[in-house]
């Protein structure tokens, strides 16, 4: 009669955490007697699984009846796989002996890996907010995955980019490993509404990457350009001045006037106009009784945006061009139309 | 191609501890047996013990109080710590890998580090 | 224990002469698979020692063909058919069988 063979049909199978993995094994002889049980790994180190005739093993049932005469059916299926129940298992029969039972014959193992899907990427950005033509770094970070092959990439307003450096952990074996990838990103100062992306493809994703997402707007800052101007006359003695803060992001500035290096007025931006690309856009005016100053008048103004240091523009009135008539109850003349001469000598 | 290597103190004092490391580079922990093996200067091989992949150990009797051996799978990594040394654990100590197939058990001591020399002096 | 006694002591060779080395056993290394859990290992000076013959019989990945391991039970012998000058330094022998692994005292070969 032909010596028992005991039969691992599956070199290896796949199975996602959470599932039930069924390792199959039939035996090709009822002779001889004695107790079939699986072990995980080979040698003296080697793990019990499951004994037909003793033990108490929660998770495995097996696939068939054990107690019919005639089974040569010793498949076996465990319950709620994780990725610490990955490894090679042995199917293995074993003949009566005395005192105990002496390992006949193993099957050629199956291999377990385990499929475990990598949690959503978390995108982060710098600490610190930074202006146009700065590069900044991004984060991006994955975890949980098995197996260790992953893919992932980089887009900014859906162009792929290639400036990222991608780590997976551990480099040894592990139930599970996480991946962590740093890109760099050139700001323009039309990125308050970009969008960076990570995405993680795993063969557990059945081709639906996930997606983990980060707004330039909470990492740009656009300082504002300034431009001061003189209005036309409201009034016989007054000017008004403007001061136009265009393109800044994000909203968060302070203006102030100073009228010849003295505070005349501080106002925290409100009523912002958007543009398109996001940015903001403030005006801020002054009426400057010209008739109040004997000598000319240099308004500057000030801008602190977001916490950075003040950034100021500057406009002169020249009074000196138009004396005053002394004693006079009439009013004085027109008020300045600009910071140049009107005709003469000056 | 698996390579191993050991790293470590060369000198160690009497009564401390010895400790090293082998880092296996080009394959995998999972389904062998790592070993410590030592040689005495001018002597023969003596095991000290190994661990499995699931992180079971196996020692030297003669060594068993004095020996840990411990498995680090996420760094590639074993290590080996031996207490209160003396003068007659001055050796060159080297990690090696053994086979092992069901059926069969272990089947050979395949892969063997360089070797460090490890000298118990005050 | 098991203890492992290895012979001779010091075996001067000639190259292309044929060498044996012997390695006795305290007890018997044949199991009930059929397998005798003896390997064979060379150290060749100032190197590691390297696999040459694993379950008694079988020759090691890369080792030659002129090596060839026999024996079962408590008495094994390493045969090299023709020595050649590569092939000095010390044989151990060693028994896989249960814990602790044990070598032989060694076998250092030479040419004479």
């Known amino acids: 009669e032909e010596e028992l063979q005991v039969i691992q049909p599956d070199k290896s199978i796949s199975v996602a955490a959470g599932e039930s993995a069924t390792l199959h094994c039939t035996v090709t002889s009822l002779i001889p007697v004695g107790p079939i049980q699986w072990f995980r790994g080979a040698g003296p180190g080697r793990e019990l699984i499951y004994n037909q005739k003793e033990g108490h093993f929660p998770r495995v049932t097996t696939v068939s009846d054990l107690t019919k005469r005639n089974n040569m059916d010793f498949s076996i299926r465990i319950s709620n796989i994780t990725p610490a129940d990955a490894g090679t298992y042995y199917c293995v029969k074993f003949r009566k002996g005395s005192p105990d039972h002496v390992e006949f014959k193993s099957g050629a193992g199956t291999e377990l890996s385990v499929r475990a899907k990598p949690s959503a990427p978390v995108v982060s950005g710098p600490a610190a907010r930074a202006t146009p033509q700065h590069t900044v770094s991004f984060t991006c970070e994955s975890h949980g995955f098995s197996p260790r092959d992953i893919t992932l990439k980089w887009f900014k307003n859906g162009n792929e980019l290639s400036d990222f450096q991608t780590n997976v952990d551990p480099a040894g074996d592990s139930v599970s490993y996480s991946i962590h990838s740093t890109a760099k990103v050139v700001l323009t100062r039309e990125d308050v509404h970009s969008q960076v992306i990570c995405e993680v493809a795993h063969v557990t994703l059945q081709g639906d990457p996930l997606r983990g997402t980060a707004n330039l707007s909470e990492t740009i800052r656009v300082p504002p350009t300034l431009e001061v101007t003189q209005q036309p006359v409201r009034a016989e003695n007054q000017v008004n001045v403007t001061c136009q803060v265009r393109k800044f992001y994000p909203q968060r500035l302070q203006l102030t006037w100073l009228e010849n290096g003295n505070v005349s007025r501080t106002e925290t931006a409100s009523t912002l106009t958007e543009n398109k690309d996001g940015t903001y856009n403030w005006m801020s005016w002054l009426l400057v009784n010209v008739s109040a100053h004997r000598d000319d008048v240099k308004l500057t103004c000030q801008v602190e945006h977001d916490g950075q240091p003040a950034v100021s523009k500057s406009h002169d009135l020249k009074v000196s061009a138009h004396p005053k008539e002394q004693g006079s109850n009439t009013a004085p003349g027109p008020a300045l139309a600009s910071a140049a001469p009107l005709g003469g000598s000056g | 191609q698996v390579q191993l290597q050991e790293s470590g103190p060369g000198l160690v004092r009497p009564s401390e501890t010895l400790s090293l490391t082998c880092t296996v580079s080009?394959?995998?922990?999972?389904?062998?047996?790592w070993s410590w093996i030592r040689q005495p200067p001018g002597k023969g091989l003596e095991w000290m013990g190994f661990i499995y992949d699931n992180g079971r150990t196996f020692y030297n009797p003669s060594l068993k109080s004095r020996v840990t051996i411990s498995l680090d799978m996420s760094m590639n990594q074993f290590s080996l710590k031996m207490t209160s040394v003396t003068a007659a654990d001055t050796a060159v100590y080297y990690c090696a890998r053994v086979r092992a197939y069901s059926g069969i058990g272990l089947d050979g001591t395949d892969v063997w580090g360089q070797g460090t020399t490890v000298t118990v002096s005050s | 224990d098991i203890v492992m006694t290895q012979s001779p002591l010091s075996l001067p060779v000639t190259p292309g002469e044929p060498a044996s080395i012997s390695c006795k056993s305290s007890?018997?290394?044949?199991?009930?698979?059929?397998?005798?859990?003896l390997d064979w290992y060379l150290q060749r000076p100032g190197q590691s020692p390297q696999l040459l013959i694993y379950?008694?019989?079988n020759r090691a990945s890369g080792v030659p063909d002129r090596f060839s391991g026999s024996g079962s039970g408590t008495d094994f012998t390493l045969k090299i058919s023709r020595v050649e000058a590569e092939d000095v330094g010390v044989y151990y022998c060693?028994?896989?069988?249960?814990?602790?692994?044990?070598f032989g005292g060694g076998t250092k070969v030479e040419i004479k």
């Open positions: 080009g394959g995998s922990i999972r389904n062998y047996y």
């Open positions: 379950l008694g019989s």
């Open positions: 060693m028994q896989a069988l249960q814990t602790p692994l044990t």
């Open positions: 007890q018997s290394l044949l199991y009930s698979n059929g397998y005798a859990y």
